[in-house]
């Protein structure tokens, strides 16, 4: 029959060539003469000319070594024709399969492969996987099943299997317990990867292990004791810088240390922050220190890290005693700030309160007082006794100098100490309110038409404060009610000025008395622009601008 | 009748180059491998050359390899020899054989003389 | 490279009578090996390709055959127009290799 079985052809023939593979055989050849061809990729398409077939004979030829890895199988079709060309048998399907041969090595992907595994773990665990082709073929045959294995592991220690590849997957783990960073941070295995499942070409990589830092070691005071001179009252001070070590990875939250202060602090003078760089613990004052009260301080520090321990290690502590220096300190006013209630407008000379200041030192120190700050100039302070007395009139409505009823003063007081500290103390006057001011009204310039005039209303105001402010009263003088009228409302804040007989067009002066609740009488002339003119008006029309 | 005649032989000088050329008839050329034997001239024959029906691909002995090149014409039926670098070992007579039922040297040629000397 | 060893080198023999040249392959080559007849005018022709399929328009008495390495022609009845040089070539291996040649002579 006109069917050629599949053909399995060898890669890498070693000829020689042209190499018969079979006979293409028409039985029509019988009856004719049957000429043989062939089409198809490796015949008379790319690649061409790999396979031919002799036309009166129908051999099939192989004229090249074929390569599996590069066309595992060709599909070319036979055709048979008579003397005259017409075709005598239907195309035929002729198959051939390139069979393997073993002659590729596998190939690792990378020629280094880089893992981790964190130091002390369990054997069983897995730290990472290489991987090898080869591009035999693995199915139908060993020549591409690759198995992996550990050829040589540096450094041996603490011996020399400490890893395992599992043959198949290529899966590097740990087999052998006693991993520390501290003592091996890294192993370098050199892996083989091996073609006939192991028993045929080996080719080699290296797999670097990088053994991770695991919180294995506790950071240790070195030294454990230490002395520090501190002054007094110094906040942010530097006491002590506690050194220690950690065998851990450097900058690493297992190295990195926190610092506690266990004992010796009831006061909560001290703190203690880490370096960021150096790992030391900076021992600081968060309060002032005070030698008179308690001139030294032990303190018990611990350390751990920023990280938790990954087994039960013991803490290492450091004793500090904190030596306080006795420095001069400066007088401290009692109160800082003295509030004192003093009627305004007294007389020179009156005293206005005494203020002074005591010396946390012990040994009894001479303290004198000064005014630092007295802006209106209108207080006196006696350098021995602290008495303050007035030395000008204190002005509650001296709107410059007085805030809110308030009179700040800056006082001074310096010890005889070497060399003298000074403490400042403030003084808050309270300004009590006299009866010094009468009510004035707002406008004091009015204009108004002489026909049908409008009502103008004029504001009281009183720089006193109440009970010497409203109610208010009104009266017109010096012939002025004859024209005018003048009522203050209801409310007793504003005054209403009335134009009550014709006056025509000029300017006059209106005398209007003012007095407050506790009597106090201010006279004041109000400027009235009478205009030619009906109902309201704000200047006179037509030419006339007064005078 | 398949025939096969070759030409181009000569006296040629070491170091020489010499062309040989083997017309074909009486069958389809383009569809058979062909090859070059030498015979010496203490009458051994050895394999020179041989080259795909298509042209595509060739082969050759170590003794000639990189000195000699097969090639074809299948449009004009004709094989060729081009020798270079010639030795006086390459003395000998050339015959051209076509491959038949996808065997070597079915058909011969009557061979051309080379010779190889100063 | 595979060697062909050819026996006898010479064979004197009458007309009439049986001959056998032998070739022996150094390695194994199959059935890939051809017997060729050289006249004294230089004619080359195939005799038997593949051991022992005879070429079309050779005599019957012309027969190939293997047993093991060793390779055989064998001319049943001598005639006149056998007398010449004859060579086996081997084709399972390369490079081809050609026998030394049996020179076959008129008693």
């Known amino acids: 029959d006109w069917v050629v079985a599949p053909i399995s052809v060898p890669e890498n023939g070693k000829g020689p060539f042209p190499q018969r593979l079979n006979q293409l055989k028409s039985n029509k050849d019988r009856d004719t003469k049957i000429f043989y061809s062939i089409t198809g990729p490796g015949a008379d398409s790319p690649p061409e000319g790999v396979f031919a077939v002799e036309k009166e004979t129908g051999w099939l030829l192989l004229n090249k070594p074929l390569d599996r890895e590069e066309i595992a199988k060709y599909e070319l079709y036979g055709h048979a024709v008579s003397e005259n060309g017409a075709s005598v048998e239907e195309p035929m399907n002729i198959s051939i399969i390139v069979t393997d041969q073993n002659d590729n090595k596998p190939k690792f992907t990378q020629d280094t492969f880089r893992g981790s595994v964190l130091e002390g773990v369990l054997p069983g665990t897995s730290v990472m996987q290489v991987t090898a082709t080869d591009e035999d073929d693995a199915i139908y045959t060993y020549n591409g099943v690759v198995a992996y294995s550990i050829h040589s592991q540096e450094p041996k220690d603490p011996h020399d299997l400490m890893f395992t590849i599992h043959r198949s997957t290529g899966t590097i783990s740990v087999i052998s317990s006693g991993l520390d960073r501290e003592k091996v941070p890294e192993y370098t295995l050199t892996i083989q990867a091996t073609d006939m499942d192991g028993d045929g070409s080996t080719t080699t990589a290296v797999a670097v292990v990088e053994i991770l830092d695991a919180n294995d070691n506790a950071p240790m005071f070195d030294p454990q004791k230490y002395e520090a001179h501190v002054p007094e009252n110094a906040v942010g001070h530097e006491v002590q810088r506690l050194t220690v070590t950690d065998l851990d990875a450097p900058n690493s939250p297992a190295w990195r240390a926190t610092y506690l202060i266990m004992g010796g602090d009831d006061g909560d003078h001290f703190t203690i922050t880490t370096h960021p760089e150096s790992n030391q613990g900076i021992l600081t004052t968060r309060k002032g220190l005070d030698f008179e009260a308690k001139n030294q301080h032990t303190l018990y520090v611990e350390v751990t890290n920023e990280a938790p321990f990954v087994l039960k290690l013991p803490t290492s502590t450091a004793t500090i005693v904190v030596h306080v220096e006795d420095v001069n300190e400066a007088p401290v006013f009692v109160p800082p700030s003295k509030v004192v209630e003093v009627q305004e407008g007294i007389p020179t000379g009156e005293p206005v309160c005494v203020y002074t200041a005591e010396d946390p030192d012990k040994e009894n120190q001479k303290i004198s007082y000064r005014i630092l700050r007295d802006p209106a100039g209108w207080l006196a302070m006696d350098p021995d006794s602290g008495q303050v007395t007035a030395v000008g009139t204190l002005d509650r409505e001296d709107e410059q100098f007085v805030r809110n009823n308030i009179y700040e003063v800056m006082v001074l007081a310096m010890d005889n100490g070497s060399p003298p500290t000074t403490g400042t103390g403030t003084l808050l006057l309270t300004l009590i309110d006299v009866n010094d001011h009468g009510p004035v009204p707002e406008p004091r310039q009015i204009t108004i038409c002489n026909q049908s005039p409008v009502r103008q209303v004029l504001n009281i105001t009183d720089k006193d404060l109440s009970p010497h402010t409203s109610p208010f009263q009104a009266q017109l003088t010096d012939d002025s009610d004859i024209y005018w009228t003048a009522e203050v409302n209801e409310e007793g804040d504003t005054v209403v000025l009335s134009l009550k007989k014709f006056l025509k067009q000029d300017t006059y002066d209106v005398h209007l008395s003012l007095s407050d609740h506790g009597n106090k009488e201010q006279l004041t002339v109000i400027r009235a622009t009478v205009c030619d003119c009906h109902g309201h008006v704000e200047t006179c029309p037509g030419p006339w601008k007064g005078g | 009748v398949q025939l096969v005649e070759e030409s181009g032989g000569d006296l040629v000088k070491p170091g020489g180059s010499l062309k040989l050329s083997c017309a074909a008839s009486?069958?389809?050329?383009?569809?058979?491998?062909m090859s070059w034997v030498r015979q010496t001239p203490d009458k051994r024959l050895e394999w020179v050359a041989t080259?795909?029906?298509?042209?595509?691909?060739?082969y050759y002995p170590d003794s000639v390899k990189g000195r000699f090149t097969i090639s074809r014409d299948n449009a004009k039926n004709t094989l060729y020899l081009q020798m270079s670098s010639l030795k006086s070992e390459d003395t000998a007579m050339y015959y051209c054989?076509?491959?038949?039922?996808?065997?070597?040297?079915?058909?011969w040629g009557q061979g051309t003389t080379v010779t190889v000397s100063s | 490279e595979l060697q062909m060893t050819q026996s006898p080198s010479s064979l004197s023999a009458s007309l009439g009578e049986r001959v056998s040249l032998t070739c022996r392959a150094s390695?194994?080559?199959?059935?890939?090996l051809n017997w060729l007849q050289q006249k004294p005018d230089g004619t080359i022709k195939r005799l038997i390709y593949?051991?022992?399929s005879l070429d079309s328009g050779v005599p019957k008495r012309f027969s190939g055959s293997r047993s093991g390495s060793d390779y055989s022609l064998t001319i049943s009845s001598l005639e006149s127009e056998d007398f010449g040089d004859y060579y086996c070539?081997?084709?399972?291996?390369?490079?081809?290799?050609f026998g030394a040649g049996t020179k076959l002579e008129i008693k």
């Open positions: 054989a076509s491959y038949y039922y996808g065997s070597p040297f079915a058909y």
């Open positions: 009486g069958f389809t050329f383009s569809t058979y491998g």
């Open positions: 080259i795909s029906s298509g042209g595509h691909y060739s």
């Open positions: 390695q194994d080559i199959g059935s890939s």
């Open positions: 593949d051991t022992s």
């Open positions: 070539v081997q084709y399972g291996s390369s490079p081809l290799t």
